[in-house]
């Protein structure tokens, strides 16, 4: 059996902190018995020079005197094999070896797991000289160990170009289970199986695990770390965690919370960044995802206006960037706005319905029907048209603008005439005789300027021709009407 | 499902030795640690001793003297004995899980009387 | 040699809450105390009631919840039914023992 010296196996503290039996500093082993000679511990190793079998790594000084025989081989003390131990305790372990005083200048150095222990350590090496041979002892000391304290400590001396190394000290600290894995919070679909992990280590091994669901324990018998519980499906949210024990004690994980996806919350806050004519610009506050990501939105319009049909108008936008631009709206038009937003379960129900209008806008038709005449006798050019249709106007009338273009004879003058909004008929002064004028009208709003009417040309004798027929807005299909005295 | 049995004798004499069993089922002994529980009549619970899933084991240290807890894990039994036996010493025994104590056996009674 | 303390009786109401307290000899009680609670009715053996980190055992319906109030360890019934009229034994874990409180008889009238 592995030579050991065990600290009895009492569970410690779930938490550090004062607690009976825990406050011990140091630890002694309780046990330090030679190992039986050649005896090489299971589960320990020693480096070796390839080529060479190993009995402790012994070396064979190679001096001799006249007189005297060779010096016997040199190898250290078998001492404690496997040191067990709780967390935070101290521990001290040594290696011990006698070299003739022929040999000058020995240093020990300690090792674990094959890498050398470089400053930081509490490593003491103590001599103590006789008439032919000095005992060496190295001493290594931890003051609190941790798990990373675990694994194999050697010794090492160089002599005589050799390298003398010690059988393993084997340190093993033990403690509370150490999670590795611990259960993920999830956002689950009602009734859906979903697996939850856990895993925990020692030593001491072996871990178990009990489940807590809403601090119910899920499984009357422990099951050997790692665990999976399966849950079969939930219906509300759980909270669920994972009890790990071994010989030392329990610890528990984080706990989780396992939600159910359900459809949205409506959005709130919703509200108008900017309104021109024909759009608005609205942002909005999601509500509440439902444990689900957002996939899109439907923004739903309605008319305002009681005498409207109360048809509603859908618009699809992705969930992001919460800003939508509703087009293709009326001038001067109130319109009811909601939003909606869905996630793999469903749409929410739609947000606070918002009042919104819309700004005059320019018309958006020109004036019909215009019609052009010379008055000669008052040397005048008579205009008539009807107005546009009302809903078309797209804000209050304000006016009208007159465009009168006259051409002669290689030369091109535009004019524009503002006339108010009361009437459909404007006169305008003859400009030059023996001329075309091409007259254009546009109503105008508080919106802006709508569009001309098509070009209405009539030609303008010089002084003294007869009579005169009017030009009118042609039909459609028509371009560029002319009327020839 | 996990249950646990004692059993042992319902009557010993001053001075003897208690032998108690208690035979586990539905789980290993290398997964559980198992405690031993008294209740002498009318009184309240006193706990004895464990055997963990590693072999070690810790007793009530005003018995200790008296107490040797064992296990052999292939037959999933744990055996309590208890030396120099007294008339205070009766009680019914329970054995039970050790860090929650909710799995119990139903409990042996044990008499101590010449 | 440590002390753990227990009210001797309790009574409650149908319906009702009651706490019932385990108080240390040592100090306060903590989780590393790991509070076993047990129920036991006359005849019977003792069950398992609350332990480890607080849990309550598979089939404890959530009327019963465990907690540290204080610097004492507590047992919280809610809704106490009549079938809840037992003795309320509380444990605790002491680095390498249990130590079992005297039990408190809780009746509910």
């Known amino acids: 059996a592995i030579t050991e010296a065990r600290e009895e196996a009492k569970p410690y503290p779930l938490f550090p902190g004062p607690f009976p039996g825990s406050l011990q500093t140091d630890h002694t082993p309780l046990l330090s018995l030679p190992h039986a000679s050649g005896y090489q511990p299971a589960l320990m190793f020693s480096p070796t020079q390839p080529g060479r079998p190993h009995t402790g790594n012994v070396a064979i000084p190679q001096v001799t005197s006249v007189e005297s025989k060779p010096l016997p081989p040199l190898a250290f003390k078998h001492t404690v094999g496997h040191i067990i131990l709780s967390e935070h305790k101290g521990v001290k372990f040594n290696c011990s070896i006698s070299v003739p005083n022929i040999y000058q200048d020995t240093t020990i150095s300690w090792w674990k797991d094959g890498k050398e222990l470089l400053g930081a350590h509490h490593a003491i090496t103590q001599f103590y000289p006789d008439d032919e041979v000095t005992a060496i002892i190295a001493s290594f000391s931890i003051t609190s160990v941790q798990r990373s304290d675990n694994g194999s400590y050697i010794c090492k001396m160089k002599i005589n170009n050799e390298e003398i190394v010690s059988d393993p000290i084997y340190i093993e600290v033990q403690g509370l289970p150490h999670f590795t894995k611990q259960p993920e919070s999830m956002n689950v679909t009602r009734n859906t199986a979903f697996n939850l992990t856990c895993q925990a280590v020692g030593p001491p091994e072996p871990v178990n695990i009990f489940w807590v669901q809403n601090s119910s324990r899920v499984n009357e018998q422990p099951e050997k770390s790692p665990s999976v519980l399966t849950v079969p499906g939930l219906t509300e949210m759980a909270v669920f965690s994972c009890e790990a024990h071994n010989d030392k004690g329990l610890t528990v994980s984080k706990g989780v919370q396992i939600n159910i996806k359900a459809i949205p919350s409506p959005p709130t806050e919703v509200s108008i960044r900017n309104s021109t004519a024909h759009s608005i610009l609205i942002s909005w506050v999601p509500g509440f995802d439902g444990y689900s990501p957002f996939r899109n939105c439907s923004i739903q319009v309605k008319e305002a206006d009681p005498l409207s049909n109360g048809s509603v108008m859908i618009f699809n936008t992705s969930a992001l960037p919460h800003l939508y631009q509703i087009k293709q709206l009326q001038a001067l038009a109130n319109y009811s706005i909601g939003v909606s937003c869905m996630n793999e379960i469903g749409w929410s129900a739609v947000s606070p319905w918002i009042l919104a209008s819309t700004t005059e806008g320019a018309p958006s038709v020109a004036p019909l029907n215009v019609t052009v005449f010379l008055n000669e006798s008052s040397d005048n050019v008579d205009i008539r048209w009807m107005k546009p249709p009302t809903k078309q106007q797209d804000g209050e009338l304000v006016g009208y603008r007159i465009s009168h273009v006259w051409q002669s004879a290689g030369i091109s003058k535009e004019l524009l005439e503002e006339v108010g909004q009361n009437g459909s008929r404007a006169r305008i002064s003859v400009q030059v005789h023996n001329a075309t004028c091409t007259v254009r009208i546009a109503a105008v709003t508080r919106g802006g300027v709508g569009p001309f009417s098509d070009p209405v040309k009539i030609f303008i004798p010089a002084h003294g021709w007869v009579d005169y027929a009017p030009s009118s807005t042609p039909a459609p299909g028509n371009a560029d009407p002319v009327l020839i005295i | 499902q996990v249950t646990l049995k004692e059993s042992g004798p319902v009557l010993v004499k001053p001075t003897e030795t208690l032998t108690l069993t208690c035979t586990v089922s539905g789980i290993s002994l290398s997964s559980f640690a198992i405690s031993w529980i008294r209740q002498p009549p009318g009184k309240a619970l006193e706990w004895l001793a464990v055997?963990?899933?590693?072999?070690?084991?810790d007793y009530n240290s005003a018995l200790k003297s008296r107490l040797t807890i064992s296990k052999d894990t292939s037959k999933s039994q744990v055996v309590l004995t208890m030396t120099n036996m007294d008339p205070v010493d009766t009680a019914t025994y329970y054995c039970a899980s050790h860090w929650y104590l909710d799995v119990w056996g139903q409990g042996t009674t044990v008499t101590v009387s010449s | 040699q440590t002390v753990v303390t227990q009210e001797p009786s309790f009574s409650v109401s149908p319906g009702g809450t009651v706490t019932l307290t385990c108080r240390s000899s040592t100090g306060a009680v903590s989780t590393s105390n790991y509070a076993n609670w047990v129920q036991q009715t006359p005849g019977q053996a003792p069950r398992g009631l609350i332990g480890?980190?607080?849990s309550r055992a598979p089939g404890i319906p959530d009327r019963f919840s465990g907690s540290i109030l204080g610097n004492k360890a507590a047992l919280t019934i809610t809704g106490a039914q009549a079938d809840d009229e037992s003795d309320y034994y509380c444990a605790l874990w002491f680095s390498n023992h249990w130590v079992f409180g005297g039990g408190t008889k809780l009746t509910v009238l």
């Open positions: 480890g980190a607080n």
């Open positions: 055997i963990w899933t590693g072999g070690g084991t």
